[in-house]
C-alpha cells in the first residue's frame, strides 16, 4: 500500500514538473509573441508615418528637383562628414550641374552666410584627378580652384559661390544630399 | 538582435575578382546605408564603399573604378564586387549596417589575401 502510494506520489511530481515545464515554455512563447507583436507595430507604425507625411524631404532638408539636400549644424572632418550623411541614408553632395551649384550656394547665403561646406569630391592621390564619391568625374566647370598646397589627402569644399581645395583633414560644416521621394499622387 | 554574415574572403592572386556579400538578418530594421569597410594589419579600417537605401554610391579614391558595390533590398544584402585586386588590398572587410533607428551594426569580418 505504501509502495502505492509513493508510486502516485512520484507520478503526481512527475505531472507537476511536466505543467512547470509547459507554463514556462508558453511563458516564453508569450514573451516572444510579444516582442514580434511590438517590431511589427513599430514597422506598422513607421510605414503608416511615411504614409501620412509624403513629404519629398526629410524635416530641415531642403528640396531642390529630384534632389534634398542637408545642411549641417556641426563640423567634422571630410571622412566623419561622409559617415555622418550615410547614417541620414545619403551621401555627400555632389554637384551636377550650374543650376545645382547656384541653388546651394543661393540657399547657405541664406542659411548661413560664408562658411565652408564639405562636398563629396576629392582628389586621387596617384592621378591627381577629382572625381565625386560614385567615381564619376565633375562637369569641367565645377572644377575646385587650386589652393591646397597638401601633401595629405585632398577634398573638395563649397564656400560662397565657389569650389575650393583643402587638407580632408581640415574641420568644415558639410552637405549631404539624397534623391527626394516621388509623390504617389 | 542584427546578425551581419559575411562572405566570399579568401586567399586571391594579384589581378583576381572576388566578391563578397554580407546579409542582414535579425529582428525586422529599416536600412538607411549598408557598407563596406576594411582594415590592413597595423592600420585604421577605412570605408571602402557605401550605398543608401536610394541607391547612391561612395567610395574610397583607392578603389573607384575596380571595385562596385550593389545590394539585394529584398534580401537585405549587400555586395563588393573587387577587380583588379593588388597586393595592398590585402585586408579584413567588414560589412556595417546603417540602420534608420540610428543604431549600426558590424559584421565579424572575412580576411581578403592578396597574394601569388
Known amino acids: 500500500k505504501l509502495l502505492q502510494v509513493s508510486t502516485i506520489a512520484m507520478q503526481q511530481q512527475e505531472k507537476l514538473i511536466q505543467q512547470e515545464r509547459a507554463l514556462l515554455n508558453f511563458t516564453e512563447w508569450k514573451r516572444s509573441c510579444a516582442l514580434q507583436m511590438k517590431y511589427c507595430q513599430a514597422f506598422m507604425q513607421n510605414s503608416l508615418s511615411s504614409a501620412h507625411n509624403s513629404s519629398p524631404c526629410p524635416n530641415n532638408w531642403i528640396q531642390n528637383r529630384e534632389s534634398c539636400y542637408y545642411v549641417s549644424e556641426i563640423w567634422s572632418i571630410w571622412h566623419t562628414s561622409q559617415e555622418n550623411c550615410l547614417k541620414e541614408g545619403s551621401t555627400l553632395l555632389q554637384i551636377e550641374s550650374k543650376e545645382e551649384m547656384d541653388f546651394i550656394t543661393g540657399s547657405l547665403r541664406k542659411i548661413k552666410g560664408s562658411y565652408d561646406y564639405w562636398v563629396g569630391l576629392s582628389q586621387d592621390g596617384h592621378s591627381g584627378r577629382w572625381l565625386w564619391q560614385d567615381g564619376s568625374s565633375p562637369s569641367p566647370g565645377l572644377l575646385p580652384a587650386e589652393r591646397s598646397q597638401s601633401a595629405n589627402q585632398v577634398c573638395g569644399y563649397v564656400k560662397s559661390n565657389s569650389l575650393l581645395s583643402s587638407n580632408c583633414s581640415t574641420w568644415k560644416y558639410f552637405i549631404c544630399e539624397k534623391y527626394a521621394l516621388r509623390s504617389s499622387v | 538582435q542584427v546578425q551581419l554574415q559575411e562572405s566570399g574572403g579568401g586567399l586571391v592572386q594579384p589581378g583576381g575578382s572576388p566578391r563578397l556579400s554580407c546579409a542582414a538578418s535579425g529582428r525586422f530594421f529599416r536600412v538607411n546605408a549598408m557598407g563596406w569597410y576594411r582594415q590592413a594589419p597595423g592600420k585604421q579600417r577605412e570605408l571602402v564603399a557605401a550605398?543608401?537605401?536610394?541607391?547612391?554610391?561612395a567610395y574610397a579614391d583607392s578603389v573607384k573604378g575596380r571595385f562596385t558595390i550593389s545590394r539585394d533590398s529584398a534580401k537585405n544584402t549587400v555586395y563588393l564586387q573587387m577587380n583588379s585586386l593588388k597586393s595592398e588590398d590585402t585586408a579584413v572587410y567588414y560589412c556595417k549596417v546603417f540602420a534608420a533607428d540610428g543604431m549600426e551594426y558590424w559584421g565579424k569580418g572575412t580576411q581578403v589575401t592578396v597574394s601569388s
Open positions: 550605398i543608401t537605401n536610394g541607391g547612391q554610391t
